[in-house]
Amino acid sequence: MRTEAQVPALQPPEPGLEGAMGHRTLVLPWVLLTLCVTAGTPEVWVQVRMEATELSSFTIRCGFLGSGSISLVTVSWGGPNGAGGTTLAVLHPERGIRQWAPARQARWETQSSISLILEGSGASSPCANTTFCCKFASFPEGSWEACGSLPPSSDPGLSAPPTPAPILRADLAGILGVSGVLLFGCVYLLHLLRRHKHRPAPRLQPSRTSPQAPRARAWAPSQASQAALHVPYATINTSCRPATLDTAHPHGGPSWWASLPTHAAHRPQGPAAWASTPIPARGSFVSVENGLYAQAGERPPHTGPGLTLFPDPRGPRAMEGPLGVR
């Protein structure tokens, strides 16, 4: 839930004046309060559908619910990306789309969601218990991933509930990222307010030292928060994952995108190609992973942990974004 709070204009403290409850300390709680209240929790949703017309064909749909801009989407199967999963498609908002068999068609649906159709025949075709994962690299939230699968008993005529145990991941790097800062900020805010309640307002005194707080503290969440958020992967082995696709991971540098046509996902298609009726999406999962983009050795084809961002090719974003979360 996102609400808005008004923040007083930030004014520099008067020269030479700073105290325990000086300008800086009075303004900081308001800033932190605003951050705490307005920070929506990022989330990734996943749907896996079996096409009714081609029973061995799947459509994977997934999207990112967050306030940042998406810089890369990776769809994998056989487990999460970087944990035994095999990349099926990589979608970049500017540099286009790259996909590997059995992926037939990867497309952007909105600026925060994608779909991927998998071929239904051949040695590398998926089976019902295959796990499909979507990983969204976003700034400033970092990397978020969720997984879903069809239960083995999938029948186009029937509709079963989604698999009960989602694959969850919480990378320590992400906890130390934006979420950590916000968590610390909220705790610090409570601490300030509590301290303020038990202490008379002091007089302003001349400043002897720089009023900057040490930065390292902001990146150190409590052990309790780490314990609460660190959920290991529940790895699912599947006989359907072809070993031959393991070499398809995009480990190349920026030149890897050179052959990709911009807006490869935006060629309009007639209704016929998309007319099959999917049966229910099975498996729609909430993600808890928030890694800062990607772990070493499995970075998207740009350097730096979320610092080198690509411009969005879809033109300037609308003033308000999707559902008010942009």
Partner: antibody, heavy 118, light 107 residues
Framework: QVQLKQSGPGLVQPSQNLSITCTVS????????INWVRQSPGKGLEWLGV???????EYNAAFRSRLSISKDTSKSQVFLKMNSLQADDTAIYSC????????????WGPGTSVTVSS | DLQMTQTTSSLSASLGDRVTISCRTS??????LNWYQQKPDGPLKLLIY???RLHSGVPSRFSGSGSGTDYSLTISNLEQEDIATYFC?????????FGGGTKLEIK
Amino acid sequence: QVQLKQSGPGLVQPSQNLSITCTVSGFSLTGYGINWVRQSPGKGLEWLGVIWSGGNTEYNAAFRSRLSISKDTSKSQVFLKMNSLQADDTAIYSCARDSTGLYAMDYWGPGTSVTVSS
Amino acid sequence: DLQMTQTTSSLSASLGDRVTISCRTSQDISNFLNWYQQKPDGPLKLLIYYTSRLHSGVPSRFSGSGSGTDYSLTISNLEQEDIATYFCQQGYMLPPTFGGGTKLEIK
């Protein structure tokens, strides 16, 4: 600001075709899906179909044989075409924006009231 | 098609009341549920998406909850401007389907 405007006929003869244009402003069709929904007293709200930013479409199976959704991104227009209308197709037809892929329609057009009658 | 049932078609409440509108689905929809408000002769207005996420600009007195096949929309402190018809809608399987609506009236 975000706006969806609709234009189309109010009266359609039975067995004739329906064409409605949804013209959007305040956002680009390259980043959003556009759904078509109709509402009638007898049948309530019925989802007809969607065209996503990438151009791919999805249709309600009940209408697929006579429904077509297309768009002209450069003109910020989305088109609904429905063939062989009958009296029970009388309804208010609306286009609505989808921002997340969740079929959650955050902005709606005003609706086009369509009466099928001779 | 997946069936959406809003058992209460009409609901009366007093201003300031806490009002809960329910929606039941014919199968598990994994939280892919949205809520809309519609005033007479007006378009639908998105309130809540993905079960509990508040759409921008919607007052915080609106909240959504639920899981599996049972979902609800709650208005914590009913105001005059909330008098309208409320629809639930699933986005879990094609085609997306809507409930029949719950008309909220003042006692």
